[in-house]
């Protein structure tokens, strides 16, 4: 079953995928595709690496991490609802049927509508305007805008989002991570 990751319309989505090269410089080709991993290759390829470089990509998709050390996590820029779905990260290990395949489910949520300003209450200490959505590598941030009048429902929503962020971080070392060699 797929691990689920969430992002908001207009933000950057982050889909983690890692491997450990057998030895420094022993990189293996990786492909990312939209749709579940097929038997071979990736369907609807959005990005591909060879043993050295990124050698194919489509706009809005890139590897922000140190892919030459095995961080082949995919960043999707400025997501829309159409970006929802299953993505395949395939570590193309040499040999017959040696590939490691990971299916990651991306759920895109509609952008929050900033409520009309009412009497200002100071929640900035408890709820800073920028929430870091992952703890590994360059921080992706979610802009929450001004929070003038937060009720209990909104606090609950924020808590859920923070929980989702922590879950994504926790999954880094358990989900799409393999050691080669």
């Amino acid at each position: 079953s797929e691990v689920e990751y969430r992002a908001e319309v207009g933000q950057n989505a982050y889909l983690p995928c890692f491997y450990t090269p057998a030895a420094p410089g022993n990189l293996v080709p990786v492909c990312w595709g939209k749709g579940a991993c097929p038997v071979f290759e990736c369907g609807n390829v959005v990005l591909r690496t060879d043993e050295r470089d990124v050698n194919y990509w489509t706009s809005r998709y890139w590897l922000n991490g140190d892919f030459r050390k095995g961080d082949v996590s995919l960043t999707i820029e400025n997501v829309t609802l159409a970006d929802s779905g299953i993505y395949c990260c395939r570590i193309q290990i040499p040999g017959i049927m040696n590939d490691e395949k990971f299916n990651l489910k991306l759920v895109i949520k509609p952008a929050k509508v900033t409520p009309a300003p009412t009497r200002q209450r100071d929640f900035t200490a408890a709820f800073p305007r920028m929430l870091t959505t992952r703890g590994h590598g360059p921080a992706e941030t979610q802009t929450l805008g001004s929070l003038p009048d937060i009720n209990l429902t909104q606090i609950s929503t924020l808590a859920n989002e923070l929980r989702d962020s922590r879950l994504a971080n926790d999954l880094r070392d358990s989900g799409a991570t393999i050691r080669i060699g």
Epitope: P24, L27, E51, R52, D53, V54, S59, R68
Partner: antibody
């Protein structure tokens, strides 16, 4: 010490081919990639491609695909770059350069350059 | 392919000046940017790789920074021997591409 020594200057007519050699010493030839870069007179740098001597794997800049071939001779630690169907805008200094994983495949040692002039 | 837009093209300097040049990638390249120095009649020399890593033997007056699409190369105190052309290069994707160069000239 690491050295990359390239072959001498060449003058060619349009439509001809040129083959530039690059003899490596001072390191294990098969442990590093060999990239080829050119520089037209007074211009910037343009990457043509690379070859990995260990397995003869190559990657070429699409702009030169079909015209460029990179090869190596492991017994003499020499890399070769052949460019065919030469045009006047291929007039440039051609460099071989070593690249390796330790520097994220940037080019840490360069040959002295080979001037190729294409003129009728 | 990724376009590397380097500015400025020319930079008049005096010894001791602090100089900064920039390179902007047409799409994110992570930290995969290098900087090279080329003196007249010579081959390029690697100074910085992976955005901020100084290559072996390169004086610490040369520094690089940036990530994503925006990168900066700084010489903290220019010496006469630093007069040269400086190129940025993205080493993220194939084909690798270079900036057009920044030439340091005497004021």
């Amino acid at each position: 010490q690491v050295q990359l020594v390239q072959s001498g200057a060449e003058v060619k007519k349009p439509g001809a081919s040129v083959k530039v050699s690059c003899k490596a010493s001072g390191y294990t030839f098969t442990d590093y990639y060999m990239d080829w870069v050119r520089q037209a007179p007074g211009q910037g740098l343009e990457w043509l491609g690379y070859i990995y001597p260990n397995n003869a794997g190559t990657s070429y800049n699409q702009k030169f695909k079909g015209r460029v071939t990179m090869t190596t001779d492991k017994s003499t630690s020499t890399a070769y770059m052949e460019l065919r169907s030469l045009r006047s805008d291929d007039t440039a200094v051609y460099y071989c350069a070593r690249s390796g994983y330790g520097n994220y495949y940037t080019m840490d040692y360069w040959g002295q350059g080979t001037t190729v002039t294409v003129s009728s | 392919s990724i376009v590397m837009t380097q500015t400025p093209k020319f930079m008049p300097v005096s010894a001791g000046d602090r100089v900064t040049m920039t390179c902007k990638a047409s799409q994110s390249v992570g930290n995969n940017v290098a900087w090279y120095q080329q003196k007249p009649g010579q081959s390029p020399k690697l100074l910085i790789y992976y955005a901020s890593n100084r290559y072996t033997g390169v004086p610490d007056r040369f520094t690089g920074s940036g990530s994503g699409t925006d990168f900066t190369f700084t010489i903290s105190s220019v010496q006469v021997e630093d007069l040269a052309v400086y190129f940025c290069q993205q080493h993220y994707s194939s084909p690798s591409t270079f900036g057009t160069g920044t030439k340091l000239e005497i004021k």
